[in-house]
């Protein structure tokens, strides 16, 4: 996911609705004006704000990368939701890119979890049932399987 820079909005476009801040804050879907006296709406499909705020700009919408599918579009109150394409996943410790799921488990291990957009296949030792570390095995050690079918 590419999080763009924040979008300054120093001049309100004619279509942007204005209202007054409540307790110094503007509602989701708005940002505060530079003089602090008005709430200016974010631009649909361009930027958003999710909470009551006194930000001087709305947050720019995320654009889904190639290799991602758009689950839901950006609205004035919610950012775009992107998901890795089938056969790829995004790890918590490297959320900036989708990685290819492994095609199978190392020898002596059995697959217990499928490839999902947020996790690689899950392998456990046949005997002990302990999980594999997740290191990609050497090709000759791999027992391949097509997605969604258990390894033999």
């Amino acid at each position: 996911i590419t999080q763009q820079d924040l979008a300054p909005q120093q001049r309100a476009a004619p279509q942007q609705k204005r209202s007054s801040p409540s307790e110094g804050l503007c509602p989701p879907g708005h940002h505060i004006s530079e003089d602090g006296r008005d709430c200016i709406s974010c631009k649909y499909g361009q930027d958003y704000s999710t909470h009551w705020n006194d930000l001087l700009f709305c947050l720019r919408c995320t654009r889904c990368d190639s290799g991602e599918v758009e689950l839901s579009p950006c609205t004035t109150t919610r950012n775009t939701v992107c998901q890795c394409e089938e056969g790829t996943f995004r790890e918590e410790d490297s959320p900036e890119m989708c990685r290819k799921c492994r095609t199978g488990c190392p020898r002596g291990m059995v697959k217990v979890g499928d490839c999902t957009p947020w996790s690689d296949i899950e392998c456990v030792h046949k005997e002990s049932g302990t999980k594999h570390s997740g290191e990609v095995p050497a090709v000759e050690e791999t027992v391949t399987s097509s997605p969604g079918t258990p390894a033999s």
Partner: antibody, heavy 117, light 110 residues
């Protein structure tokens, strides 16, 4: 002349309370957001909190619960009520005028608060 | 909250030197950043706002640049009266995120 003057500082014992005042002249405090900032001896600037033009108040985590910002529009004066004072609250306390896009454009000269037994 | 990381914390320079101070925000603040100068025993004085707009009465040797998370204050030719401490402060979302100042940069005579 547009200016801010803080008063009310002095020596106070730990656990005590103090109210600082910030008198504005040349402009109307209720038309601006106003901010309190402090500076411990030899240290940097520390944001305490602010009050919006509509009277809403917001505080830094370190000030929540012990410090209260208020305003008297008829006196054109801002206040900082400080309770349960500790030695680490010893600092010069500044009030300042805050404009949303343009930053803190007008500062008072500060008042020194010393918390010591 | 937004954290502001200022560097260096101190520097030694001579009159006439070009001095650069940087400030990094923990999240993007567009161009809504101010720079302040403080001399001993005095309150801070605003130098620059909106990252690059010079405040009234501030000499043109001071300039600011940057947007997003990375900002720079430059003094093109250091003068004797410029030896002071400099602070940055974000100006967007003070209620939302707080208004923590950078840690300060003390500019000393070499």
């Amino acid at each position: 002349e547009v200016q801010l003057v803080e008063t009310g500082g002095g020596l106070i014992q730990p656990g005590g309370s103090l109210r600082l005042s910030c008198a504005a002249s040349g402009f109307t405090v209720s038309r601006y957001a106003m901010i309190w900032v402090r500076q411990a001896p030899g240290k940097g600037l520390e944001y305490i909190g602010f009050i919006t033009s509509d009277g809403s108040t917001y505080y830094a985590d370190s000030a929540k619960g012990r410090f209260t910002i208020s305003r008297d529009n008829s006196k054109n004066t801002l206040y900082l009520q400080m309770n349960s004072l500790r030695a680490e609250d010893t600092a010069v306390y500044y009030c300042a005028r805050y404009t949303y896009s343009d930053g803190t454009d007008l500062w008072g000269r500060g008042t020194l608060v010393t918390v010591s037994s | 909250d937004i954290q502001m990381t200022q560097s260096p914390s101190s520097l030694s320079a001579s009159v006439g030197d070009r001095v650069t101070i940087t400030c990094q925000a923990s999240q993007s603040i567009s161009t809504y950043l101010s720079w302040y100068q403080q001399k001993p025993g005095q309150p801070p004085k605003r130098l620059i706002y909106k990252a690059s707009t010079l405040a009234s009465g501030v000499p043109s040797r001071f300039s600011g640049s940057g947007s997003g998370t990375d900002f720079t204050l430059t003094i093109s030719s250091l003068q004797p009266e410029d030896f002071a401490t400099y602070y940055c402060q974000p100006n967007s979302g003070i209620a939302t995120y707080g208004a923590a100042f950078g840690g300060g940069t003390k500019v000393e005579i070499k």
